[in-house]
Amino acid sequence: QLPPGKPEIFKCRSPNKETFTCWWRPGTDGGLPTNYSLTYHREGETLMHECPDYITGGPNSCHFGKQYTSMWRTYVMMVNATNQMGSSFSDELYVDVTYIVQPDPPLELTVEVKQPEDRKPYLWMKWSPPTLIDLKTGWFTLLYEIRLKPEKAAEWETHFAGQQTEFKILSLHPGQKYLVQVRCKPDHGYWSAWSPATFIQIPSDFIMNDHHHHHH
């Protein structure tokens, strides 16, 4: 029987910069029941606080609700593991909420086949940013990525769309049914999950473009 091994806070995420959650990985348990507590202070403070919510984020987590979350201050946190034989502490972790945002997927993905008379046909898609993200403030830039594949294909084809919320793809296989998805990330954050798949049937008379190009 031993004191617990050193825990590690390995992940922090915020869906919208208004709340966030951090998760830790326990070290070895030393063969005894182990209690974990997360303590933190914010930059400019010396007063230590205990995690306000150990439940919402699931096991080995700490959730900071709206009233505990500030974008203006760096959080300095640490996890303490204690059993009957002693204690161990994680390394201190510094968290700036700006840099842990993982948004919800983009919304309202619509996909259409466009067949203008004077030009080659193309696949046109548009979407909306996730509702929880406030893009009006200016500091929050979302980047988008699209993936698509014929229904029965194994490999996805991905396209980076930058900050645009619409996109054209010129090269597609006629007669195929395609799955299309989109995801987003802030410049210094994390990719969202992929949006639910949207299906589109490519007409049999769709003319393949000579070059496998996509256009913004």
């Epitope: 203006w72 700036d96 700006t98 210094h188």
Partner: antibody, heavy 118, light 112 residues
Framework: EVQLVQSGAEVKKPGSSVKVSCKAS????????IHWVRQAPGQGLEWIGE????????NYNQKFKGRATLTVDKSSSTAYMELSSLRSEDTAVYYC???????????WGQGTLVTVSS | DVVMTQTPLSLSVTPGQPASISCRSS???????????LHWYLQKPGQSPQLLIY???NRFSGVPDRFSGSGSGTDFTLKISRVEAEDVGVYFC?????????FGGGTKVEIK
């Protein structure tokens, strides 16, 4: 203990490429961005770019875009910085550095001296 | 790119005496999220840089309280209240508000 251990010194010819490695240990490699910074002899520090090891997303200093390539190997917890079309002005100590969930550099590698000389 | 200008270039200080280093940026370092990402690093002789102060005035873990940072907008200062022999090296200010991140030219601190 967090450690960033870099590869050894290199001497390269002008026009060639160099690939510097940075092996991370003591933490979950995919959690934090890795930055690359260089320091020419007797000079200041110059930021080359950054990479998120979780998805290999990169941001580059425009000055190095097209010449510097940042990559990671998650299986060995190693980050790499490759610089091509080397010239004498690229002679410098190249550092990898790690952030937290922040945008400043908390841990630094020991540095790798790259000398470009004909 | 944001140009960071440090003064003085070098500083020779008697142990126990204070020291002050100035850093000026060519544009405001207030991020659109309201934070100011101005940091100070020390590079001791033969070593890699180490973080001293983050976000203008916050001491990093293990940094002695004789180091303090202040300033806002474009003008920033690092102060050492009582210089010790172990404080010798080159001090760099750095901004990470704007990409590319940039550094000042450095201030070399020596002991008299």
């Amino acid at each position: 203990e967090v450690q960033l251990v870099q590869s050894g010194a290199e001497v390269k010819k002008p026009g060639s490429s160099v690939k510097v490695s940075c092996k991370a240990s003591g933490y979950t490699f995919t959690s934090y961005w890795i930055h690359w910074v260089r320091q020419a002899p007797g000079q200041g520090l110059e930021w080359i770019g950054e990479i998120d090891p979780s998805d290999s997303y990169t941001n580059y200093n425009q000055k190095f875009k097209g010449r510097a390539t940042l990559t990671v190997d998650k299986s060995s917890s190693t980050a790499y910085m490759e610089l091509s079309s080397l010239r004498s002005e690229d002679t410098a100590v190249y550092y990898c550095a790690r952030s937290f969930f922040t945008n400043w550099f908390a841990y630094w590698g020991q540095g790798t001296l790259v000398t470009v000389s004909s | 790119d944001v140009v960071m200008t440090q003064t003085p270039l070098s500083l020779s200080v008697t142990p126990g005496q204070p020291a002050s280093i100035s850093c000026r940026s060519s544009q405001s370092l207030v991020h659109s999220n309201g934070n100011t990402y101005l940091h100070w690093y020390l590079q001791k002789p033969g070593q890699s840089p180490q973080l001293l102060i983050y976000k203008v005035s916050n001491r990093f873990s293990g940094v002695p309280d004789r180091f303090s940072g202040s300033g806002s907008g474009t003008d920033f200062t690092l102060k050492i209240s009582r210089v010790e022999a172990e404080d010798v090296g080159v001090y760099f200010c750095s901004q990470s508000t704007h990409v590319p991140f940039t550094f000042g030219g450095g201030t070399k601190v020596e002991i008299k």
